[in-house]
Amino acid sequence: MRTEAQVPALQPPEPGLEGAMGHRTLVLPWVLLTLCVTAGTPEVWVQVRMEATELSSFTIRCGFLGSGSISLVTVSWGGPNGAGGTTLAVLHPERGIRQWAPARQARWETQSSISLILEGSGASSPCANTTFCCKFASFPEGSWEACGSLPPSSDPGLSAPPTPAPILRADLAGILGVSGVLLFGCVYLLHLLRRHKHRPAPRLQPSRTSPQAPRARAWAPSQASQAALHVPYATINTSCRPATLDTAHPHGGPSWWASLPTHAAHRPQGPAAWASTPIPARGSFVSVENGLYAQAGERPPHTGPGLTLFPDPRGPRAMEGPLGVR
């Protein structure tokens, strides 16, 4: 969910004490307010670790730093789920877990974090530079996705730093963020006051800019902190994707997905809907899920992701992608 807050443009101060300090002090509360409001924006972190014992084994951990309740988590590799990535596991907080090879064990770690162990041999083994993505959906409020991969130089057994690096609880992150912003604001105000005391107010020419000055845009969080917190989507080595699965048939895809901020939601915010739901005790629900189908006298609907929602009479490979969207 991208929060875009409009920040009034900083106008040059007018001569004299009131002019020099007036505009700045008027603008500062707005800037601080914007930063405070956006400090609690939900974020997703991703951590990828290669096991030292088995070089083809990966552990992916993902978490949601937000106050909303999670309705579904999707883990994919080779890119975001809607942009050619292949789904490895889908976790529902109440109804269970579904996973596909080479995923070995997906589970909830906390109410807002999950882990997935991948083991690969041959065609379905992931490579060191494979991108793994986690998407946390909170229906109908919004969904948040982030991706991560092992750094090229990382040794087996070492984990990639989570993206964002600090794995903080959402409320703590919010408190720290707001405190930091307020502290920064106070220091900045003191700095302005000191500077004004030592220097006479400069006499500036009237602004030559148009009356409708361009407005500064503040993303949530700011782009500077965004750069510090997130590793951009890594290069995708498609040869490392599983040959055994029915993948999403990538055919280029939109070029803009790589530049999306990882906290950006894919859906607009809607009315708050779901109260927090308790996460069941740890453990895989895959057998339970399959058992439900077995009781009904049928096998699970599929053995791999990427099935066609709008089937094509010409056959399964006639379309580009499971939705039938060309």
Epitope: R95, P301, T308
Partner: nanobody, 121 residues
Framework: EVQLVESGGGLVQPGGSLRLSCAAS????????MGWFRQAPGKGLDEGVA????????KYADSVKGRFTISRDNAKNSLYLQMNSLRAEDTAVYYC??????????????WGQGTQVTVSS
């Protein structure tokens, strides 16, 4: 990224009909079900009002059975919900969603912005 856009909502009298449409566009999607979900004002989100999976299995909420019909047009990548004999309690925001089946129920992973349906005299 898949984009789901709903249309067809509006104000209708009790006993009237509406047809909701959902157009799917974008890249690709790897879920195995689609459906219509709704959220009434001041209430929580309903389970799937009407859902359909890859195998063509259709499921309706008890409250809409015999009145609502879900269908899809593969050539147009569209999903529809025909709503007949509408009641005041059908007033809600209706969401078109694509997702994953768990225990026979469709859980949304991607959805549209919703379309408002108001049943009032």
């Amino acid at each position: 990224e898949v984009q789901l856009v709903e249309s067809g909502g509006g104000l209708v009298q009790p006993g009237g009909s509406l047809r909701l449409s959902c157009a799917a566009s974008g890249y690709s999607y790897s879920g195995d079900c689609m459906g219509w979900f709704r959220q009434a004002p001041g209430k929580g989100l309903d389970e799937g009002v009407a859902t359909i999976d890859n195998a063509g299995r259709i499921k309706y909420a008890d409250s809409v059975k015999g009145r609502f019909t879900i269908s899809r047009d593969n050539a147009k990548n569209s999903l529809y919900l025909q709503m007949n004999s509408l009641r005041a309690e059908d007033t809600a925001v209706y969401y078109c969603a694509a997702g994953w089946t768990f225990g026979g129920q469709c859980s949304p992973a991607d959805w549209g912005q919703g379309t408002q349906v108001t049943v009032s005299s």
